[in-house]
């Protein structure tokens, strides 16, 4: 099987979601989790981590092989206490495998302005709030 | 034993919005896709969406996009489906059901005693 | 979307006689056809998945059948408690639908 996994951001006015999804067959969503860790270069683990989700079991229709889970991480206002750097992660509770993603940064300027980078080229981000910018 | 019970009957306005829930009890509730499907006075089922509350994907069918948002509670294991811009021809029994174990079930095994909503001015 | 075409709309037979309602797709669905029967006044109940599978606690008079685009779901011998109304509905892809449904009513 192959499992993939990716990170991308999207801004709604000040908020700031934070986004990891999981591409994977049905079966095997089981015992996976998917979690993200924040300034956690070497120990990223649920235990560790901002937020963590199972993986979907289930893709609510039947005419598919891959489903897509998403665990999204919201910053309401982004302030300096959130600069940093950031990395999607899943690991398998039953058979150990551990997938790890890119890693992405948080900056936050003197101006009070932050900026998003790491992020795939792929991931299509527009803000539409001059507050923040994704590169 | 699962059980879905739903809220009350609503009488609204045209224009005004309403929120139905539906409290799920005795299984894993963000394990399992939440369906949201009306029946209008002698017509047939009309799916409305669903939403896996899990990580809250939600899917909503055309006719209902920018009208009908879906929402789970996980902390309550409540599902709720919010119409918004009602007309009269929103009157219905509001159904939520759970979508079954996919390839072991797949279809809607249980399902919420229906919320009737009348919209009239 | 997938369009679920249900025939015939009224079939009005009698205690003991065979019914067979007819569910047709407007795409291939493979066997994810799931079959309902709804009583007046009631919520819809789950009677057949996967076009054929059993569901435990419906009784053996019912049946499914077909694949792809055609269904069948057959009553073998008519209950006076099966005069009801049938649904269809798929679960290929998005958006889920229904079919329009087949009311049975006692001739």
């Known amino acids: 099987g192959c499992i993939n996994i990716t990170s991308s951001a999207s801004q709604e006015g000040t908020r700031l979601n934070l986004i990891c999804t999981v591409w994977h067959k049905k079966e095997e969503a089981e015992g996976f989790v998917v979690f993200l860790c924040k300034d956690r270069s070497g120990d990223c683990s649920p235990e560790t981590s901002l937020k963590q989700l199972r993986l979907k079991r289930d893709p609510g229709i039947d005419g598919v092989g891959e489903i897509s889970s998403q665990l999204m991480f919201t910053i309401s206002q982004v302030t300096p206490l959130h600069s940093g750097t950031y990395q999607c992660c899943a690991r398998s509770q039953k058979s150990g495998i551990r997938l790890q993603g890119h890693f992405f940064s948080i900056l936050f300027t003197e101006t009070g302005n932050y900026t998003v980078t790491g992020l795939k080229q792929r991931q299509h981000l527009e803000f539409s709030h001059n507050e923040g910018t994704l590169s | 034993q699962v059980q879905l019970v739903q809220s009350g009957a609503e009488v609204k306005k045209p224009g005004a919005s309403v929120k139905v829930s539906c409290k799920a009890s005795g299984y894993t509730f963000t394990d399992f896709w939440m369906q949201w499907i009306r029946q209008a006075p002698g017509q047939g089922l009309e799916w409305i969406g669903a939403?896996?509350?899990?990580?809250?994907?939600?899917r909503v069918t055309q006719k209902f996009r920018g009208r009908a948002t879906l929402t789970a509670d996980k902390s309550t294991s409540t599902a709720y489906m919010e119409l918004s811009s009602l007309r009269s021809e929103d009157t219905a029994v509001y159904y939520c059901?759970?979508?079954?174990?996919?390839?072991?079930?797949?279809?809607?095994?249980?399902w919420g005693q229906g919320t009737t909503l009348t919209v009239s001015s | 979307e997938i369009v679920l075409t249900q025939s015939p709309a009224t079939l009005s037979l009698s205690p003991g006689e065979r019914a067979t309602l007819s569910c047709r797709a407007s795409q291939s669905i493979s066997n994810h056809l799931h079959w309902y029967q709804q009583k007046p006044g009631q919520a819809p109940r789950l009677l057949i998945k996967?076009?054929?599978q059993s569901i435990s606690g419906i009784p053996a008079r019912f049946s499914g059948s077909g694949s792809g685009t055609d269904f069948t779901l057959t009553i073998s011998s008519l209950e006076p408690e099966d005069f009801a109304v049938y649904f269809c509905?798929?679960?290929?892809?998005?958006?889920?639908?229904f079919g329009g449904g087949t009311k049975v009513e006692i001739k």
């Open positions: 939403i896996y509350p899990g990580d809250d994907d939600a």
């Open positions: 996967y076009a054929s």
């Open positions: 059901a759970r979508r079954g174990i996919a390839a072991v079930v797949g279809g809607f095994d249980y």
């Open positions: 509905q798929q679960s290929n892809s998005w958006p889920l639908t």
